[in-house]
Interface confidence: low
């Protein structure tokens, strides 16, 4: 079943390559387990950036080597992606799935365009 | 008389606060003198950033203290805005006027959203 997911249109990564945005979903029921997936769309290719399943009221747990971290609050998920470089600029899509209890719901946002600018290297300190 | 002006939707300033974009106009006639004005729209306020009048085939000449530089090639103007900070993020609109010979034509682009990220300061070199 479809579910509405909202996310900002544009976000700028900071000069350390970190970008944060909120993914908000309109829950049709009281879910206890939610899965959030971040997808990157570039040149009509869609790849999975990271994913986490969490119990409502608990922290999001991404894999140890994931570039994503996040926190949840009600129907909002605060996502942070780090280690971004200019070449990672692209459309980052938030996909939310309500896993438990049934019925299963899934929603996909329109995507957040994340812009990344590589910093100038600092001069060598002699 | 109206004239079509095209410019990119989004441009990122680099880490030195420099943003470049092309402003292209569909000239209805053979203009010898063209005026290009860059306007910034933010919070429904429109302010003039810089302006230059140039003869076709010659360099664009902005005022000495202008934050803009540019070159022209046919019906394209390559504009560069420097000294940008994060607070300068906004919609930069290209306005083109064909001044000579008559008739006078004017066109305004839809604007280029320039995003600017302030760089992290480099660590002190002790």
């Amino acid at each position: 079943k479809a579910m509405h997911v909202a996310q900002p249109a544009v976000v700028l990564a900071n000069s350390r390559g970190i970008a944060s945005f909120v993914c908000e979903y309109a829950s049709p029921g009281k879910a206890t387990e939610v899965r959030v997936t971040v997808l990157r769309q570039a040149d009509s290719q869609v790849t999975e950036v990271c994913a986490a399943t969490y119990m409502m009221g608990n922290e999001l747990t991404f894999l140890d080597d994931s570039i994503c971290t996040g926190t949840s609050s009600g129907n909002q998920v605060n996502l942070t992606i780090q280690g971004l470089r200019a070449m990672d600029t692209g459309l980052y899509i938030c996909k939310v799935e309500l896993m438990y209890p049934p019925p299963y719901y899934m929603g996909i946002g329109n995507g957040t365009q994340i812009y990344v600018i590589d910093p100038e290297p600092c001069p060598d300190s002699d | 008389k109206a004239m079509h002006v095209a410019q990119p939707a989004v441009v990122l300033a680099n880490s030195r606060g420099i943003a470049s974009f092309v402003c292209e106009y569909a000239s209805p006639g053979k203009a010898t003198e063209v005026r290009v004005t860059v306007l910034r729209q933010a919070d429904s306020q429109v302010t003039e950033v810089c302006a230059a009048t140039y003869m076709m085939g010659n360099e664009l000449t902005f005022l000495d203290d202008s934050i803009c530089t540019g070159t022209s090639s046919g019906n394209q103007v390559n504009l560069t805005i420097q000294g940008l900070r994060a607070m300068d993020t906004g919609l930069y609109i290209c306005k083109v006027e064909l001044m000579y010979p008559p008739p006078y034509y004017m066109g305004i682009g839809n604007g280029t959203q320039i995003y600017v990220i302030d760089p992290e300061p480099c660590p002190d070199s002790d």
């Epitope: - | 053979k30 004005t37 302006a51 009048t53 005022l63 006078y104």
Partner: antibody
Framework: QLQLQESGPGLVKPSETLSLTCIVS??????????WGWIRQPPGKGLEWIGT???????YYDPSLKSRVTISVDTSKNHFSLKLNSVTAADTAVYYC??????????WGQGTLVTVSS | EIVLTQSPATLSLSPGERVTLSCRAS??????LAWYQQKPGQAPRVLIY???NRATDIPARFSGSGSGTDFTLTISSLEPEDFAVYYC?????????FGQGTRLEIK
Amino acid sequence: QLQLQESGPGLVKPSETLSLTCIVSGGSTSSNTYYWGWIRQPPGKGLEWIGTIHYSGNPYYDPSLKSRVTISVDTSKNHFSLKLNSVTAADTAVYYCTRQYINFFDFWGQGTLVTVSS
Amino acid sequence: EIVLTQSPATLSLSPGERVTLSCRASQSISRYLAWYQQKPGQAPRVLIYDASNRATDIPARFSGSGSGTDFTLTISSLEPEDFAVYYCQQRSNWPITFGQGTRLEIK
């Protein structure tokens, strides 16, 4: 050094045509950078722009004079001309030929007084 | 058309004094304003163009400022040869127009 020199009759009868020529020396009327124009100044009054021309394009005239004025340029003779027809006493003025560089007039002739009188 | 209004019409001052002449446009002309000086029996000569740029060979005591609708020409210390009529002129829009002039005379 660029020099502009107006020439033409100093007295014109009402309803006739005022004709002036500006001879350009030390520069070229076929320059892509410059425009050539006429400005007049009635006795004891201010400056009035008449019109401007570029060698490659059409002239542009003050709307109040447009129906009576013709400005042309002859690059082979390196001069440009003004014709103002159906003149009246109100057209009595010192007429200056000028070089226009984009937004301003950087060189002027010394001016010639044209009197409209019968 | 754009109307340029200069003030004052006449100004009486002494050599060495500082003077500020005003030119106001009936609508915004950005910085597309020039100032001219005209002495009796002579053609005008350009002093300032694009509101604040001094023309070639113009002394540093002449300066211009302003943008939009309000512009000023400042002479920091009047020299005897500065007593003349001063005109402003716009080329922001057609037709090209001049102000009516400010006469600067010796007190």
